[in-house]
């Protein structure tokens, strides 16, 4: 008996061919013998089954002898044994229908979960391999669970369904709704502005929903909320902001804050939450703000960084053009008696420089000029 | 398997410069600092300077400053350490280190034997 | 520039013994910024390039035996070797790098008694 695999929705052709090379009678019916349809000479014929409106047949091949049962629009209530009836023969073809779904919403937040449920006829035992856009392969049987999904599940899910050593694939579109990055540092001068954005990695039609960010500066014991917007197609408007500092906020998507002056204060980390309509979760991207400051007080010329600063990041004092005279991995280098010119503080990881800010020390008769 | 490759051996006369070379396989060098370490015949190890690979930024030891130079080719994923004005004292083998993800020096070249003889 | 020093210079130790090396800095090489002690060990065996063996004092670099293990804090650390194994015949090098320039102890002999 040969064995053929359909995938629901689809459109399946079981094959029947007669020995003779020409139009001759046949019909197909299913294993309760109920005729399905045939011909009677050149017309197609149907008969009682429940697959009437999607049984079809190609009259263009029945002058070659062959007889197709095509079955549109598949359920897996169509899986049965269907035989073909041709020159006293009869031919047996067994059809497995198989359905993959996703459990919910095919749009899910970064770090759900993604269950794919296959649907299979009574009496079969399938086995499912999936891969995920970014290769990974996930076995089961009839469920399959992807716990903590991240940015790089994104995309078109291949899904292999094996059963009698026949199989069916299955593509399944997935959006993992995230921003394009979990977490971002910005480096600042103190006195510069500070430019915040938070670009999401998906776009859909319409995108409406609420926001805010909450900041823990290094300097303050407690986090406390910057600003709250809301979303509705793609707009963003404001709805609260502090007086200290005062954000302002684009009103077009990618999500965009200023930050007038970067400021010792303000360093720290902060916490932007995404809340989207009809979406249980949030959306979350981490946002840190490094501020560094070089000055000059009486004989002692001081660097200093505020924030989240790794412990591989180096802090050095140097004349320009010069080796660096104080290296160290603080948060605080500074040097006594500075001869004058143009010294720079650099904040640097591996010798890749993140941040530096330039002071000129005059000589000691005259005051610091910072440009 | 992530390895750093150098030149080979070199002898030289002084006031001659050497040029060592320091070919990174496994890895893109760009990620880390490269700092360059000797090690005289049965002496211990000093350390020369670094380089970094992607921004081209250098820091030298007080010592080699001005004998010193230190470059890049990063389409061959190299770094080049080279000290002039060679005396017998530069007698050492010569060691390229990556600096790892946590600072210390997590992997080495096999080390270019360089003799300064006349 | 920060001066590390070690002791002994040399060490003979008995298979399956404890060995035990110390460094001592010219100045703190613990960030105050951090709370990080910015100290590496590394053994070097007759031909071969260092091989790290210990990073912020304390922490083993993979693949390292936890018969090797570091502590120390400030100014003052210590290598110690468990049970000394024929192989961890070498020599043992202390370098601190929290600030440049970069510098290692003179290094400690470790033979077998």
């Known amino acids: 008996k040969k064995v053929v695999l359909g995938k629901k929705g689809d459109t399946v052709e079981l094959t029947c061919t007669a020995s003779q090379k020409k139009s001759i009678q046949f019909h197909w019916k299913n294993s309760n013998q109920i005729k399905i349809l045939g011909n009677q000479g050149s017309f197609l014929t149907k008969g009682p089954s429940k697959l009437n409106d999607r049984a079809d047949s190609r009259r263009s091949l029945w002058d070659q002898g062959n007889f197709p049962l095509i079955i549109k629009n598949l359920k897996i209530e169509d899986s049965d044994t269907y035989i073909c009836e041709v020159e006293d023969q009869k031919e047996e073809v067994q059809l497995l229908v198989f359905g993959l779904t996703a459990n919910s919403d095919t749009h899910l937040l970064q770090g759900q979960s993604l269950t794919l449920t296959l649907e299979s006829p009574p009496g079969s035992s399938p086995s499912v391999q999936c891969r995920s856009p970014r290769g990974k392969n996930i076995q089961g049987g009839k469920t399959l669970s992807v716990s903590q999904l991240e940015l790089q599940d994104s995309g078109t899910w291949t899904c292999t369904v094996l059963q009698n050593q026949k199989k069916v694939e299955f593509k399944i579109d997935i959006v993992v709704l995230a921003f394009q990055k979990a977490s971002s540092i910005v480096y600042k001068k103190e006195g510069e502005q500070v430019e915040f954005s938070f670009p999401l990695a998906f776009t859909v039609e319409k995108l409406t929903g609420s926001g805010e960010l909450w900041w823990q500066a290094e300097r303050a014991s407690s986090s406390k909320s910057w600003i709250t917007f809301d979303l509705k197609n793609k707009e963003v408007s404001v709805k609260r902001v502090t007086q200290d500092p005062k954000l302002q906020m684009g009103k077009k998507l990618p999500l965009h804050l200023t930050l007038p002056q970067a400021l010792p204060q303000y360093a720290g980390s902060g916490n932007l939450t995404l809340a989207l309509e009809a979406k249980t979760g949030k959306l979350h991207q981490e946002v840190n703000l490094v501020v560094m400051r070089a000055t000059q007080l009486q004989k002692n010329l001081t660097c200093e960084v505020w924030g989240p600063t790794s412990p591989k990041l180096m802090l050095s004092l140097k004349l320009e053009n010069k080796e660096a005279k104080v290296s160290k991995r603080e948060k605080a280098v500074w040097v006594l008696n500075p001869e004058a010119g143009m010294w720079q503080c650099l904040l640097s990881d591996s010798g890749q420089v993140l941040l530096e800010s330039n002071i000129k020390v005059l000589p000691t008769w005259s005051t610091p000029v910072q440009p | 398997q992530v390895q750093l490759v150098q030149s080979g051996a070199e002898v030289k006369k002084p006031g001659a410069s050497v040029k060592v070379s320091c070919k990174a396989s496994g890895v893109t060098i760009s990620n880390y600092a490269i700092s360059w370490v000797r090690q005289a015949p049965g002496q211990g190890l000093e350390w020369m300077g670094w380089m970094n690979p992607n921004s081209g930024n250098t820091g030298y030891a007080q010592k080699f400053q001005g004998r010193v130079t230190m470059t890049r080719d990063t389409s061959t994923s190299t770094v080049y350490m080279e000290l002039s004005s060679l005396r017998s004292e530069d007698t050492a083998v010569y060691y390229c280190a990556r600096e790892g993800l946590l600072d210390a020096f997590d992997i080495w070249g096999q080390g270019t034997m360089v003799t300064v003889s006349s | 520039d920060i001066v590390m020093t070690q002791s002994p210079d040399s060490l003979a130790v008995s298979l399956g013994e404890r060995a035990t090396i110390n460094c001592k800095s010219s100045?703190?090489?613990?960030?105050?910024?951090?709370?990080?002690?910015?100290l590496a060990w590394y053994q070097q065996k007759p031909g071969q390039p260092p091989k790290l063996l210990i990073y912020w004092a304390s922490v083993r670099e993979s693949g390292v035996p936890d018969r090797f293990s570091g502590s120390g804090s400030g100014t003052d650390f210590t290598l110690t070797i468990s049970s000394l194994q024929a192989e961890d015949v070498a020599v043992y090098y202390c370098q601190q790098y929290y600030s440049t320039p970069i510098t290692f102890g003179q290094g400690t002999r470790l033979e077998i008694k």
């Open positions: 100045q703190s090489v613990s960030s105050s910024s951090y709370n990080k002690n910015y």
